[in-house]
């Protein structure tokens, strides 16, 4: 092909090539042709004769102003036609007359201001019709019943001001899953407008200035329709009362989106008419007081999003939002509750009472004063089968005994990014009999004891990154009870002292993060009592991160038990010479990181076993000694291996001898070196 199109598996991509005409030299068996972002002004039907197998044609982002009716004659199998971002202004009855197999027609962002006659009457198989971002002033798309298989009609960002039954009755035999009317200036819903449509399942009116009274009218018009999903995001619905959604009483609405409404007052029984509702989006509002009956009637809601729904009006404490006790008691089926990023004063004793099916609760950054978690804080969740609880970013400074004793089903507890500073007695976790993961990273300080985790033997993941960990060198180890642990993160704690039994018994451990500590002394032969083999027995360890610990020595047997190790990161240390058989047992190693050390020599007797099955190697920024003895074997290995070695040309440079300084290692000439073959 003379054009620069890329062709793969009957798909031709000719986008972004500044084409002014359709290429005539593509394979004739292509089924998908992408001509977007070019300079096409027309689509001559003759140019498509050779591409009769096309099922999808995308000519978006061109300057096409007219379409030849014969185009679809040449493309009898065409199912998807995308004409978005062009300059079409007129559609005649002939335009798509031969496009009888179309399932998708995209006309978004053109200049179509009016639909005359019936340009879509032949599209009996059409499923999606996108006319958004045009200048349409009405929903009138024809004069007779048509588009009986249409499921999605997208009319957002037009100039539609009224919905009229006489304009929508062309859909009398259609079942619309999605009628998208967002970002229009709709001021009127004429009587029976939605009943004109055969069945309407989804209506999207986001960014339409409805306000409370027009919303009420809308809902009355939706009475006795098939509506399931209703989206009214950013529709200036500042208040709701027990009449706002009254019309929806005669529907089976399952999804309601009221996000971004600056909603201030949610009156009692506002949603009493929605017993079938399952998904309720209320995020980004401004509710000042949730009354005990505000959510009454929502017996079937499974998902409720209240993110940033309760925000304070001013600095004054008096202006903090209020949630009455028992406000959620009606939500018997609620499984997922998101209350992130709010300004709620605290958790009251019956705040969550009645949520008997709640499994996921996010309270991240939700409270203005949740400094201490007491044994009463979560009492209202005692009868909830909660599995996941997110308490991040709440400035929590203390967890008292039995704080989570009500949460016997909890599997994941996230307490990261708080200000917790305390001795962990272990009683904090009492009652967490099914706990799988505790995330405590990024807190003020944690002092461990032998009993810190005595009551959570089911724990499989423990994250203690950057918590100024104290007493980690006690014996018995604080981690001794955690025989099911698979992930342990102790990074960024400046740990300098640990015992050889710190990880004893953790035979299921797979991931160990110890980066950014101060463990160098422990592996020095001069260490009193000799090196400390704190990795012994970790026979199932897969990932080991020891970056940035100041290591300048590695004892020969330190990795001896790590038969299943796949990834090891020893970057940003001070390693120079490694003992000959240090990696002998790492037969499964896939990734080795030794970047930014002081390694001068890469010899077979040290690195041969480690390199055997590597898929990724990082030894950048080491001061390589470019002599036969030091790197000949390495250079030959580099030039024959399939291992990925990022930035090999630019960041593997010789340091010595002086005449090789700055010279790329991979270009070192090994031909004069003897016995440097990488593979035997």
């Amino acid at each position: 092909s003379t054009t620069k199109c890329t062709v793969s598996h009957e798909v031709a991509d000719c986008s972004h090539l500044k084409l002014t005409q359709v290429p005539d030299d593509l394979p004739t068996n292509i089924t998908v042709l992408n001509l977007t972002h070019n300079q096409l002004r027309r689509l001559p039907a003759a140019n498509f004769t050779r591409y009769s197998q096309l099922t999808s044609l995308d000519v978006g982002f061109n300057t096409i102003s007219k379409l030849e009716p014969e185009l679809c004659q040449k493309l009898p199998m065409l199912k998807v036609l995308n004409l978005q971002h062009n300059e079409l202004s007129q559609l005649s009855d002939k335009t798509f007359a031969f496009c009888t197999n179309l399932t998708e027609l995209h006309l978004m962002s053109n200049s179509i201001q009016k639909i005359k006659n019936n340009p879509f009457v032949k599209q009996k198989n059409l499923i999606t019709l996108d006319l958004s971002h045009n200048g349409l002033s009405s929903t009138k798309l024809g004069t007779q019943v048509q588009l009986e298989n249409l499921q999605e009609l997208l009319l957002s960002n037009n100039k539609i001001q009224a919905l009229k039954s006489e304009e929508l009755d062309i859909f009398a035999n259609s079942s619309l899953k999605k009628l998208e009317l967002s970002s229009n200036q709709i001021k009127e819903f004429s009587p029976g407008c939605f009943h004109a449509i055969g069945r309407l399942f989804g209506l999207f009116l986001n960014n339409v200035q409805l306000g409370p009274s027009l919303t009420e009218k809308l809902c009355l018009e939706l009475a006795n329709t098939s509506i399931r999903n209703l989206s009214l995001s950013n529709s200036q619905l500042s208040t709701t009362s027990n009449t706002t959604f009254l019309g929806l009483k005669w529907t089976n609405l399952t999804m309601l989106d009221l996000s971004y409404n600056n909603l201030n007052v949610v009156g009692n029984d506002s949603f009493a008419w929605l017993p079938q509702l399952e998904y309720f989006f209320l995020e980004y509002n401004n509710i000042q007081h949730l009354f005990s009956h505000s959510l009454h009637g929502l017996f079937n809601v499974r998902y409720l999003n209240l993110k940033r729904s309760f925000t304070k009006q001013s600095i004054s404490l008096a202006s903090l939002p209020k949630i009455d006790d028992f406000s959620f008691q009606w939500l018997k089926c609620l499984e997922h509750l998101n209350m992130e990023d709010n300004d709620i004063p605290g958790i009251k004793s019956n705040m969550f009472t009645g949520l008997i099916n709640l499994k996921y609760l996010s309270l991240s950054n939700s409270f203005t004063s949740l400094r201490t978690l007491t044994n009463e804080t979560f009492v209202s969740l005692a009868h909830s089968p909660l599995h996941i609880l997110n308490l991040t970013k709440n400035k929590i400074s203390k967890i008292e005994s039995d704080a989570f004793s009500w949460l016997g089903h909890l599997e994941v507890l996230d307490l990261g990014l708080n200000e917790i500073g305390q001795e962990l007695t272990g009683q904090e976790w009492r009652g967490l009999e099914n706990i799988f993961e505790i995330y405590l990273s990024y807190n003020k300080y944690l002092q461990l004891t032998r009993n810190s985790f005595a009551l959570v033997p089911s724990l499989q993941r423990l994250m203690l990154r950057r918590v100024a960990l104290k007493n980690v060198d006690s014996s018995p180890s604080p981690f001794q009870p955690l025989r099911n642990l698979t992930i342990l993160d102790l990074s960024n704690n400046n740990i300098a002292n640990i015992n050889d039994d710190m990880l004893e018994g953790l035979e299921k451990l797979e991931i160990l993060d110890l980066q950014h500590n101060n463990l160098a002394r422990l592996w020095k032969h001069a260490n009193p009592g000799g090196p400390i083999y704190f990795l012994k027995g970790l026979s199932h360890l897969h990932i080991l991160n020891l970056e940035s610990n100041g290591f300048d020595e590695i004892p020969v047997e330190v990795f001896k038990d790590l038969f299943e190790l796949k990834i090891i990161d020893l970057g940003l240390n001070n390693l120079n010479t490694l003992p000959a058989s240090v990696f002998n047992n790492q037969v499964s190693l896939k990734s080795l990181n030794l970047q930014k050390n002081l390694i001068t020599s890469v010899e077979k007797k040290v690195f041969g076993p480690a390199f055997r099955n590597l898929t990724e190697l990082d030894m950048r920024f080491n001061p390589f000694d470019c002599t036969c003895e030091s790197i000949a074997w390495f250079v030959n290995w580099i030039n024959e291996t399939h291992t990925n070695i990022p930035e090999l040309s630019s960041h593997y440079l010789c340091n010595t001898p002086p005449h090789y300084h700055g010279f790329p290692v991979r270009l070192f000439d090994t031909s004069s070196c003897k016995d440097s073959a990488p593979f035997e």
């Epitope: 272990g426 009683q427 009993n451 009551l455 033997p457 014996s475 001794q480 004893e504 018994g505």
Partner: antibody, heavy 119, light 107 residues
Framework: QVQLVQSGAEVKKPGASVKVSCKAS????????IHWVRQAPGQRLEWMGE????????NYNEKFKTRVTITRDTSASTAYMELSSLRSEDTAVYYC????????????WGQGTLVTVSS | DIQMTQSPSSLSASVGDRVTITCRAS??????LAWYQQKPGKAPKLLIY???TLADGVPSRFSGSGSGTDFTLTISSLQPEDFATYYC?????????FGQGTKLEIK
């Protein structure tokens, strides 16, 4: 099932030493710390110390530190408690015990070894 | 060292009685308290751990309560096999001391 079987009764003279053994079975010996507890006639139980069978690390009760030595033989799955400079008040039943999955409890005990110190 | 004090040292009761034994620690032991039953010539048997958790196989008439420094063992309805000596023990920090025992006798 977990079993701790101790050596038989001993009679010792004041100033002598005694070494009591505790053979473990029904679990991996090196996995759980072994504790030693004694009980003099009509007296309360007294915790003497604990040993990590994996590496031999020990924590002693300061009261006994100068006279007690706790050791282990991993190949025999056995822990030992030796008490030296015996006095008559050391006459007691000596127990070995093991923690459970919840480590703040002794669900498993040896049957006890009576050591009598008498001249 | 944390000292454990039990009361009473002994008590007489009848079958079917409700019996309460208390144990006081000289410092906060953070609910790491166990209760044992011991019969003459036998090793102690674990009843309750972590102040209120019933050990495997222990009848539900035994219960534990309390926190911090004050703890209680309750037998709701005494059975003939319950007559024995009961000890509390803390597991907070070494040495793990025991109470002096409470001897429960038939009235």
């Amino acid at each position: 099932q977990v079993q701790l079987v101790q050596s038989g009764a001993e009679v010792k003279k004041p100033g002598a030493s005694v070494k009591v053994s505790c053979k473990a079975s029904g679990y991996t010996f090196t996995t759980y710390w072994i504790h030693w507890v004694r009980q003099a006639p009509g007296q309360r139980l007294e915790w003497m110390g604990e040993i990590n069978p994996n590496n031999g690390r020990i924590n002693y009760n300061e009261k006994f530190k100068t006279r007690v030595t706790i050791t282990r033989d991993t190949s025999a799955s056995t822990a030992y408690m030796e008490l030296s400079s015996l006095r008559s008040e050391d006459t007691a039943v000596y127990y070995c015990a093991r923690v459970g999955v919840i480590i703040t409890t002794f669900p498993y005990w040896g049957q006890g070894t009576l050591v009598t110190v008498s001249s | 060292d944390i000292q454990m004090t039990q009361s009473p040292s002994s008590l007489s009761a009848s079958v079917g009685d409700r019996v309460t034994i208390t144990c006081r620690a000289s410092g906060n032991i953070h609910n790491y308290l166990a209760w044992y039953q011991q019969k003459p010539g036998k090793a102690p048997k674990l009843l309750i751990y972590n102040a209120k958790t019933l050990a495997d196989g222990v009848p539900s008439r035994f219960s534990g309560s309390g926190s911090g420094t004050d703890f209680t063992l309750t037998i709701s309805s005494l059975q003939p096999e319950d007559f024995a000596t009961y000890y509390c023990q803390h597991f907070w920090s070494t040495p793990f001391t025991f109470g002096q025992g409470t001897k429960l006798e038939i009235k």
